[in-house]
């Protein structure tokens, strides 16, 4: 069966949108009006993972691009990256662990916890125009809460 996917955009809890910053990086900034068209559209795939009653495993690809958010160690630190994949083989139901995020819904907000690195979350900075990154703290300065907007296929 083809993996179930939906198209969506994400905004952090301060309403910053996510846009491409170079070929392999995302950044978060406030967009308005026609600039909203710059925000990345994700293809969120529902995949196998350590699913629980509170966590749904997903993979986050960039729509119509062979790029997926993935979590790897760089200089001994969990790091978020955009990784290029073979479009013939992705998305798939059984994604490698580095591509999997646990989608957690709390009070109408979403968190995306790395399956590879528990308690590390997709994060944005308070500051404008900064890279989206993998952060190891919740409830601090950095933002780990997002809202999701559905996009028609």
């Amino acid at each position: 069966a083809p993996v179930r996917s939906l198209n969506c955009t994400l905004r952090d809890s301060q309403q910053k949108s996510l846009v491409m910053s170079g070929p392999y990086e995302l950044k978060a900034l406030h967009l308005q009006g026609q600039d909203m068209e710059q925000q990345v559209v994700f293809s969120m795939s529902f995949v196998q993972g350590e699913e629980s009653n509170d966590k749904i495993p997903v993979a986050l690809g960039l729509k119509e691009k062979n790029l997926y958010l993935s979590c790897v160690l760089k200089d001994d630190k969990p790091t978020l990256q955009l990784e290029s994949v073979d479009p013939k083989n992705y998305p798939k139901k059984k994604m490698e662990k580095r591509f999997v995020f646990n989608k957690i819904e709390i009070n109408n907000k979403l968190e995306f916890e790395s399956a590879q690195f528990p308690n590390w979350y997709i994060s944005t900075s308070q500051a404008e125009n900064m890279p989206v990154f993998l952060g190891g703290t919740k409830g601090g300065q950095d933002i780990t809460d997002f809202t999701m907007q559905f996009v028609s296929s």
């Epitope: 069966a1 350590e50 966590k55 490698e96 528990p118």
Partner: antibody, heavy 122, light 107 residues
Framework: EVQLQESGPGLVKPSETLSLTCTVS????????VSWIRQPPGKGLEWIGL???????YYNSPLKSRLTISKDNSKSQVSLKLSSVTAADTAVYYC????????????????WGQGTLVTVSS | DIQMTQSPSSLSASVGDRVTITCQAS??????LNWYQQKPGKAPKLLIS???TLPPGVPSRFSGSGSGTDFTFTISSLQPEDFATYYC?????????FGQGTKLEIK
Amino acid sequence: EVQLQESGPGLVKPSETLSLTCTVSGFSLTDYGVSWIRQPPGKGLEWIGLIWGGGDTYYNSPLKSRLTISKDNSKSQVSLKLSSVTAADTAVYYCAKQRNLWGYDLYTMDYWGQGTLVTVSS
Amino acid sequence: DIQMTQSPSSLSASVGDRVTITCQASTDIDEDLNWYQQKPGKAPKLLISLASTLPPGVPSRFSGSGSGTDFTFTISSLQPEDFATYYCLQSDRFPLTFGQGTKLEIK
């Protein structure tokens, strides 16, 4: 060698809480999930739920409101608690190890304990 | 939840016979289908995973095939120790669900 062993009281009174322990060896509970499955006498198998290596749980809907699965990694033990039991909860209860092979086979249960019969009766 | 329909519910056969059991899923589960053998008073034992893969130590007379919704489990030549109850299990998504079981008896 992977081994799982269930233990607990064989008789529980209606409305009380059924408590079982699964003691494992040959693998670490931090690395592998453990499921609970039950089988009423002469009937088929029903998957109850599981606890993952990181401690997250998934409970099957029909039992969700009455079920708690927890673990103690240092003791290599997983526990199951089922509250407000009735005669319908009489069954052999099994624990089983998840295969946990990411990108290949996460959800298959590859090793099982021998099971323990729990009878709910006054 | 995914429903697993297993048939037949019981089966009589003789040593040396070829035996086939089928399992049908209510939705497409790719190849995430396992087969277990259970003898009276014993725990289920994994015989086949991912529709057709035999774990180490499982005799080659056991085989499985299928994908999507329709799956088959075959014992090519029944041995005396094969008389038991067999269950399919879908491991595609939670909650995991079993077939009703097939009791294989001596004719």
